[in-house]
């Protein structure tokens, strides 16, 4: 159930509407819950989940990651720079979320929900950002060729790619939520 559509909301008509920050917080939590559900399926199917972070780091995926310069950490925190990084990162993750769409059997709907909820989250964050010009949108042609390349991998590499995308996306969202807690 997407955020804001649970029975508690229906049963409480006099509740204050969610603020922009609360809506973003709730949206990220919803996506993280979706990632947990997807990871249950991937971990049941392969032993990727037992692999160490270091072993998995030896890959060619250029997944978005928070760095000191992005202004999202406590030291050197910069609200606008950080917000731009969060939105840019989410836009970069979209191609990887598209790749995930055909990777699940029993959790097909959940994979779609994560993808659609991320699009909604990007919209929420874009409304919050003042400096939209600083946000670079990924090139569609580059994304299309990346998608083709990922889908052409052998089964083992596809399993590893799926696991890496989910884990990296989770860590990116957690870092985003930590940063948003300061805004």
């Amino acid at each position: 159930v997407p955020p804001g559509e649970d029975s508690k909301d229906v049963a409480a008509p006099h509740r204050q509407p969610l603020t922009s920050s609360e809506r973003i917080d709730k949206q990220i939590r919803y996506i993280l819950d979706g990632i947990s559900a997807l990871r249950k399926e991937t971990c049941n199917k392969s032993n990727m989940c037992e692999s160490s972070k270091e072993a998995l780091a030896e890959n060619n995926l250029n997944l978005p990651k928070m760095a000191e310069k992005d202004g999202c950490f406590q030291s050197g925190f910069n609200e606008e720079t950080c917000l731009v990084k969060i939105i840019t990162g989410l836009l970069e993750f979209e191609v990887y979320l598209e790749y995930l769409q055909n990777r699940f059997e029993s959790s097909e709907e959940q994979a779609r929900a994560v993808q659609m909820s991320t699009k909604v989250l990007i919209q929420f964050l874009q409304k919050k950002a003042k400096n939209l010009d600083a946000i670079t949108t990924p090139d569609p042609t580059t994304n299309a060729s990346l998608l083709t390349k990922l889908q052409a991998q052998n089964q083992w590499l596809q399993d590893m790619t799926t696991h890496l995308i989910l884990r990296s996306f989770k860590e990116f969202l957690q870092s985003s939520l930590r940063a948003l807690r300061q805004m």
Partner: antibody, heavy 124, light 109 residues
Framework: QVQLQESGPSLVKPSQTLSLTCTVS????????VGWVRQAPGKTPEWLGG???????SYNPALKSRLSITRDTSKSQVSLSLRSVATEDTAVYYC??????????????????WGRGLLVTVSS | QAVLTQPSSVSKSLGQSVSITCSGS??????VGWYQQLPGSGLKTIIY???SRPSGVPDRFSGSKSGNTATLTISSLQAEDEADYYC???????????FGSGTRLTVLS
């Protein structure tokens, strides 16, 4: 109710591996993370590491090379393994449940319920 | 590693209120926990996620934070509150935790 219980040997020889198990009840390991903390006699507690509800581990950088945390969800158990122990690893070892919100923020050290603790002495 | 600073000891009379502070550069972006250790006993959570109280902990205990300082406040002090109190927060970058040096609370009668 929510309970965590540490078990394992109370005496370990130097250079050996310290292996402890935390058995939990009243909650599922696929809904909550579990962390390990130790406290040497008369000292401040030290966060060792944890495993979250997805099975992802995080470790204290100072101990990362010697430490391993695993889980068995079917047995509701989380295990800690500390290799090449020395006398300074003598401490009370606690397992604790990470708060529900910790999953969303990655605040795995943020714990709400503790085990009773187990004193492990490293001595020959 | 991040460093958390706490006063080493505080003393207050029975029935009074006391505030114990915890300062550190990483507190602003991380949750803060407060843990009580009675003499000869194990650790017990008094406050987690900065201001949440586990069930069974009296509402005399409250937690808050402002900037890089977190505060544990205990109102209507009782004799059984005499203990060591530790704060803990995140060590940025590895999702790990770091504990404060601890504060010994003495309740004067």
């Amino acid at each position: 109710q929510v309970q965590l219980q540490e078990s394992g040997p109370s005496l370990v020889k130097p250079s050996q591996t310290l292996s402890l198990t935390c058995t939990v009840s009243g909650f599922s390991l696929t809904s909550y993370g579990v962390g390990w903390v130790r406290q040497a006699p008369g000292k401040t507690p030290e966060w060792l590491g944890g495993i979250d509800r997805d099975g992802d581990m995080s470790y204290n950088p100072a101990l990362k090379s010697r430490l391993s945390i695993t889980r068995d969800t079917s047995k509701s158990q989380v295990s800690l393994s500390l290799r090449s122990v020395a006398t300074e690893d003598t401490a009370v070892y606690y397992c604790a449940r990470s708060s529900y919100d910790s999953h969303y923020y990655g605040d795995y050290y943020d714990v709400d319920v503790w085990g009773r603790g187990l004193l492990v002495t490293v001595s020959s | 590693q991040a460093v958390l600073t706490q006063p080493s000891s505080v003393s207050k009379s029975l029935g009074q209120s006391v505030s114990i502070t915890c300062s550190g550069s990483n507190i602003g972006s991380s949750a803060v926990g407060w843990y009580q250790q009675l003499p000869g006993s194990g650790l017990k959570t008094i406050i987690y996620s900065t201001s949440s109280r586990p069930s069974g902990v009296p509402d005399r205990f409250s937690g808050s934070k402002s900037g890089n300082t977190a505060t544990l406040t205990i109102s209507s002090l009782q004799a059984e509150d005499e203990a060591d109190y530790y704060c803990a927060t995140g060590d940025r970058g590895n999702y790990g935790g770091v504990f404060g040096s601890g504060t010994r609370l003495t309740v004067l009668s």
